[in-house]
């Protein structure tokens, strides 16, 4: 795929990191399964607030309550994990704030592993009432599939009761799980009915079964562990943005590029232009002009605003985002209509040039 020729010599590196990339490091709200979570939309002067989860509109239901600028999730489950956004619609503009929700009882790297919770799972029975093993907290066992970044700590729990007090043992892929089966071994905390593996690696992937038994019976529960090779990533651009737009001659228009990046993103807005009546240079590469880029003199580089547009402004606008790992690009088209035609949002057209992803 071909590259391009810049029309003017623009310094593309910012002298200092841009100051506003809220989406580059969304705030993370952590909840354990079964807990309630309340998040306030941190946007001011909102006439109307709408919510999305992983890009899909979020409406109220029996567990999700939306009141003013508050989102409440009752009895959180791992399925509630994801990238959330609240959008404040105002009379003149709109603004979006992103945050992550992580519902998990797996310990993440750096967390305190003293495991003070769970003591309530150790149930003492009246010595006369003989009873086969039973689960005391199935909510904590609801999440069977655990996808955990490599190097993190994993905790599987099987809170149980019974009389006499059952014993617990663990199997990996149906076979006895021995300390020597993994570098660093593992911890079993019988009082908390838990198995803890620190600094997981890809070879830890598999099915982990807790077997809880006493003389009156045996029960078991299986978790599947997937170890995700954690790695920093190049920028991710929100699908559908920037969106195609149309306006009349003399009108104003805005293109928005929403960026998710582990590392400082460098945003450029680029347009195909003509030079000496040609769209391509002698090397066959298209002429491009950098209209705006992030840096100390650029505010909110995620937005490209065009005012008092002319027919010459029509064409393709590219949002190109890079970080130290790599790049991502998405583009949109601006249609400029004669004054008598009313403008409208164009969502059908999706175009990206050959050399862009």
């Amino acid at each position: 795929r071909p590259s391009f020729s810049l029309v003017e010599d623009t310094t593309l590196e910012p002298e200092e990191p841009p100051t506003k990339y809220q989406i580059s490091q969304p705030e993370v709200y952590v909840a354990a399964p079964g807990e309630s979570l309340e998040v306030r939309c941190l946007l001011k002067d909102a006439a109307v607030i709408s919510w999305t989860k992983d890009g899909v509109h979020l409406g109220p239901n029996n567990r999700t309550v939306l009141i003013g600028e508050y989102l409440q999730i009752k009895g959180a489950t791992p399925r509630d994990s994801g990238l959330y956004a609240c959008t404040a619609s105002r009379t003149v503009d709109s603004e979006t704030w992103y945050f992550m929700v992580n519902v998990t009882d797996a310990i993440s790297s750096g967390d305190d592993e003293d495991d003070t919770d769970g003591a309530e799972d150790f149930v003492s029975e009246n010595s006369n009432n003989k009873r086969a093993p039973y689960w005391t907290n199935t909510e904590k066992m609801e999440k069977r599939l655990h996808a955990v970044p490599a190097a993190n700590t994993v905790k599987f729990r099987c809170p149980a009761g019974g009389n006499p007090m059952p014993t617990m043992r663990w199997l990996k892929n149906g076979k006895e799980f021995k300390q020597e089966h993994r570098i660093g071994g593992y911890k079993v905390r019988n009082q908390h009915w838990s198995l803890i593996m620190e600094s997981v690696v890809p070879s830890d992937k598999g099915n982990y079964t807790c077997v809880v038994e006493n003389e009156y019976g045996s029960i078991n529960h299986t978790y599947h562990l997937d170890v995700v090779e954690r790695s920093p990533h190049r920028p991710i651009l929100q699908a559908g943005l920037p969106a195609n737009a149309s306006t009349v001659v003399g009108g104003d228009v805005e293109f928005v590029c929403k960026v998710y990046s582990d590392a400082q993103p460098h945003i450029q807005w680029i347009k195909h232009v003509e030079k000496n009546g040609s769209k391509y240079g002698p090397d066959g590469l298209p002429y491009l002009k950098v209209l705006k880029h992030s840096g100390i003199n650029s505010s909110n580089a995620e937005v490209l605003a065009l005012f008092n547009v002319t027919e010459a402004d029509a064409g393709e606008y590219i949002c190109k985002v890079s970080n130290y790992i790599g790049q991502a690009n998405q583009s949109a088209w601006l249609t400029v209509l004669p004054k008598q035609q009313a403008p409208g949002r164009e969502k059908e057209i999706t175009a990206s040039p050959d050399y862009l992803e």
């Epitope: 590259s3 490091q25 190049r234 130290y324 790992i325 790599g326 790049q327």
Partner: antibody, heavy 114, light 107 residues
């Protein structure tokens, strides 16, 4: 698995040029920057520059601008770093690294000596 | 350009010790800091990225923290195989500069 394999050691005269290659495998070459880093004997690490092979975008440390040229050949998944006007203080091990700095080449020793 | 000042330049510690290395950026770099381990004759190895994320397969005794201009790298319990030189690097803006390194030795 991901691998970056660099060309062999070079001995060069002052004033000449050297071109070091870095062949990538095990990942999508066009989806990551390739960085070049050098380390003089007994010294620390210094970033020279990088290229995004998909479109050829490159970025350089100003200390090397004009002397270093970084290119990439998508057809062979190979990145190159050429350093011109060599002087004795360019004697160093030159490393290529994938964009996330998680994978590095084995290093190429370039010795500049008259 | 952003300068990375790493300290100490060398340190000696015993097996089992807690070891801490600091890195100071001349300008704010948010959390765009990585830490590497380099053994003689070998390429650097990524340990920590984005200030506090351990890279895949890196033992849990290695950790990182900090934001803005001040960063810390910690080995919670030094092992014999940890003897190496450690580097910090900012990957916020080009040129992606490294600290001058900390050589870690066993007492």
């Amino acid at each position: 698995q991901v691998q970056l394999v660099q060309s062999g050691a070079e001995v060069k005269k002052p004033g000449s040029s050297v071109k070091v290659s870095c062949k990538a495998s095990g990942y999508i070459f066009t989806s990551y920057n390739v960085h070049w880093v050098r380390q003089a004997p007994g010294q620390g690490l210094e970033w020279i520059g990088s290229i995004y092979p998909d479109n050829g975008d490159s970025s350089y440390n100003q200390n090397y601008k004009g002397r270093a040229t970084i290119t990439a050949d998508k057809s062979t998944s190979t990145a190159y770093m050429e350093l011109s006007s060599l002087r004795s203080e360019d004697t160093a091990v030159y490393y290529c690294a994938r964009g996330d700095f998680a994978y590095w080449g084995q290093g190429t020793l370039v010795t500049v000596s008259s | 350009d952003i300068q990375m000042t790493q300290s100490p330049s060398s340190l000696s510690a015993s097996v089992g010790d807690r070891v801490t290395i600091t890195c100071k950026a001349s300008n704010g770099v948010s959390n765009d800091i990585a830490w590497y381990q380099q053994k003689p004759g070998k390429a650097p190895k990524l340990l920590i990225y984005s200030a506090s994320y351990r890279y895949s397969g890196v033992p849990s005794r290695f950790s990182g923290s900090g934001s803005g201009t001040d960063f810390t790298f910690t080995i919670s319990s030094l092992q014999p195989e940890d003897i190496a030189t450690y580097y910090c690097q900012q990957h916020s803006t080009t040129p992606y500069s490294f600290g001058q390194g900390t050589k870690l030795e066993i007492k």
